[in-house]
């Protein structure tokens, strides 16, 4: 069961896996959640009754029964990992710790104006896990305003001590705030021969890459496929690093694949969730349980529901045996990966889906698109919402996109003349406007946040957030779309769609059924040529056919320009303005969402 509260002055006895140092009990709980085996923890706060060398220790624990005996101890704070919980989990930690020095390898020292600047530097440095900043009140003159970037093997400090007039904090890479490039390519027939920090077994290069992504020290990887000539190294995933942050040695070698950590794009692609099944593949590991199951899907469900299960192998039933049920072997290991992978034995293997909640919901695969036609089908664009105004009468006002369980992203120009959020209603999971009746459930709007530099659509900053009064429960028909990664600025999107209930021609009416149109992106240079009287800035993005014919129109405003990249949909643009609708050589102009990611995160993650 899910227990979120912390137990003060309580220590769990036994079950120790390892000890790390964390600045707070709250962060200890996060570290426990992300550790492959940790189910419980005990954190020691600073206290005069405790030996200072034990302050800030976070002891990660495991237990077959999922609990341990409790003992009273002053300054001890204990709790359970969030593995047992169903809610979204994030490693993002924006807290700044005053008068704490988090120890690690100090590999970079520079002057910074503020702790925030130091944190930004850490976030944009490939090696940095955390930092310590000496404030201008620091006693030693030559150390004032010094920003120390630090890293460790585990990503957590090697020790934490009290030190006046310094502040410490963590890199915000896991908050999607890094400007580092996001390199998604996997290079076939390539070995990176740089330093190995660890090696694990993986069924394919994609899982190897995802393991690299959530390993604190891994910057790139090499994977030896099952056709690799050396049998003892088949399915071996080498996690690697280098001083420069890039591979220094690339060697051509067939049956090997190499790639990069996806740390800088992890909020917009799945990195924890290994959802595939591996046929004719057996995963070896410590056996947790053997249960009968009807299918490999049922076996995966059993593994997901067993909190200690990390991966499984299912052996299908022999004909007419055991009521058609096969054997489901639930397994675990010290690092969450199989200890060995064997092929040709007829098993079907896979991983727990429990870790999927550590990924952004927006990365979940949605149902396949319907190709051709202009009318959408239910569940095709589950992030699309219809925003209604109730004054003077109820009508569709604008489109919008779900980007979080309490947040809609839309256009600022939609709110011209809207005096209060009270007159707004957000309907999600809607295909036809005719579905909306008196008793149709909707989300009230608590707050409208318009970009403070917005004046008019044509001059840019046409972006607004709606904070909902209640949270959206994600389902197949209503779920978020991913924001583009700042590290993805150079990606060329080729599969982009505009959707909405807007007019189909300039003089028309709101459509009943959600319409869709596939539209190519146009370079800003090309777009500028088409709009000589306007300034097309880098904060805008254009899309349209040269010959016209397909475009967004009145009523589509605020809705998404959705682009699919690497199987994940990204909110690349917000429908903003254009000259007429679908006119020849007049592309539609959209708010370029990637340029506003910092603004969105600042507003949605504000405490």
């Amino acid at each position: 069961e899910c227990v979120t509260q912390l137990l003060k002055d309580t220590c769990f006895e036994g079950g120790d896996i390892t000890t790390v140092f964390t600045p707070s009990a709250k962060y200890c709980q996060v570290v426990c959640t992300y550790h492959p085996r940790c189910l419980l923890f005990t954190f020691t706060a600073e206290s005069p009754s405790e030996d200072p060398t034990r302050w800030f220790t976070c002891v990660l624990k495991d237990s077959v029964t999922e609990t341990l005996p409790r003992v009273n101890r002053t300054a001890a704070i204990s709790g359970y990992s969030f593995k047992q919980c169903s809610h979204q989990i994030s490693a993002c930690n924006k807290d700044i710790y005053v008068d704490l020095d988090m120890k690690g390898i100090n590999y970079n020292s520079s002057v910074a104006k503020s702790a925030q600047e130091c944190q930004e530097r850490c976030t944009d440095d490939v090696h940095c896990h955390f930092f310590t900043y000496a404030t201008r009140q620091f006693p030693s003159l030559e150390h004032r305003n010094i920003c120390l970037l630090k890293h460790t093997q585990t990503g957590t400090p090697t020790r934490i001590t009290k030190l006046d007039k310094v502040v410490s904090g963590f890199s915000l890479k896991s908050c999607a705030l890094s400007n580092l490039a996001c390199i998604r390519d996997i290079f076939p027939n390539t070995v990176f021969a740089d330093s190995n920090i660890d090696s694990v077994m993986a069924p394919d290069a994609f899982v190897c890459g995802r393991i690299c992504t959530h390993h604190p020290g891994c910057l790139f990887f090499t994977f030896f496929s099952q056709e690799w000539p050396k049998e003892s190294q088949r399915n071996l995933c080498l996690l690697k690093t280098s001083e420069s942050g890039l591979p220094s040695t690339r060697i051509k070698k067939s049956k090997a694949l190499s790639g990069f950590s996806l740390q800088s794009c992890r909020h917009s692609i799945p990195v924890f969730c290994h959802s595939s099944f591996y046929h004719d593949t057996d995963f070896l590991g410590e056996e947790l349980d053997i249960v009968a199951a009807k299918s490999h899907e049922a076996c995966q469900k059993l593994c997901t529901n067993a909190v200690r299960c990390q991966f499984f192998t299912y052996t299908p039933a022999q004909a007419s045996c055991n009521e058609g049920k096969g054997k489901c072997y639930l397994k675990l290991s010290s690092n969450g990966s199989p200890t060995k992978i064997l092929h040709g034995r007829g098993g079907i293997s896979g991983y727990t889906l429990r870790l999927c909640k550590m990924d952004n919901e927006c990365t979940t695969k949605i149902k396949p698109r319907i190709v051709g036609g202009t009318a959408s089908v239910r569940g095709e664009w589950p992030w699309q919402v219809t925003l209604h105004t109730t004054s003077p009468t109820q009508r569709h006002l604008c489109g919008g996109s779900i980007i979080g369980n309490q947040w809609i992203l839309t256009a600022a120009h939609c709110f011209y003349g809207v005096e209060s959020p009270k007159i707004l209603r957000v309907y999600s999971g809607i295909l036809n406007q005719s579905e909306i009746k008196e008793d149709t459930s909707f989300f009230g709007v608590q707050e409208i946040i318009i970009h403070d530099q917005y004046k008019m659509a044509e001059s840019g900053y046409d972006i607004a957030l709606l904070k909902l009064e209640t949270t959206v429960n994600y389902t197949d028909s209503q779920r978020p779309i991913c924001l583009p990664s700042k590290g993805d600025r150079n990606v060329i999107y080729t599969d982009c769609w505009v959707t909405g209930w807007g007019y189909r021609k300039l003089r028309d009416k709101i459509q009943n059924t959600l319409q869709k149109a596939k539209i190519p992106l146009v370079t800003n240079e090309e777009c500028q040529k088409r709009y000589r009287g306007h300034k097309i800035t880098h904060k805008m993005i254009c899309a349209g056919y040269r010959e016209g014919g397909k475009d967004a129109c009145k009523g589509d405003s605020g809705g998404p320009l959705s682009c699919k990249h690497n199987e994940v949909w990204h909110l690349v643009g917000i429908t903003s303005w254009g000259e007429g609708c679908a006119q020849r050589e007049r592309p539609g102009v959209y708010t370029n969402v990637v340029e506003y990611v910092d603004w969105i995160l600042e507003k949605t993650q504000a405490v």
């Epitope: 070995v191 190995n196 920090i197 050396k230 190294q233």
Partner: nanobody, 126 residues
Framework: QVQLVESGGGSVQAGGSLRLSCTAS????????MAWYRQAPGNECELVST???????YYADSVKGRFTISQDNSKNTMYLQMNSLRAEDTAVYYC????????????????????WGQGTLVTVSS
Amino acid sequence: QVQLVESGGGSVQAGGSLRLSCTASEFTFDDSDMAWYRQAPGNECELVSTITSDGGTYYADSVKGRFTISQDNSKNTMYLQMNSLRAEDTAVYYCAADQWGSAEGDCTSSYPGGYWGQGTLVTVSS
């Protein structure tokens, strides 16, 4: 028990030459990727040269044109011919088999299926 034994190390004047050998026992070269690594005092282990099972070779930029890797499968031996030696080539040289990169910058620890020799010291005096 796989064993890799290096020989041929020693002291030499800058500009001189040395030829290192690595002989393997309980192990065949034919289907292995062999390499020479080196570690200078206080430095990390670095890859010098590799020769892959399909005959491909690789050299670190710092040794290109001066060092040559080769192997004799019939003798189960790999060689590193080092010419125009420089003071900065001073290091312990390690022979490695199926070892793609060092572990934690150290020329001795391996992952499954990878092997290291015990090393031979090369000292180049200027």
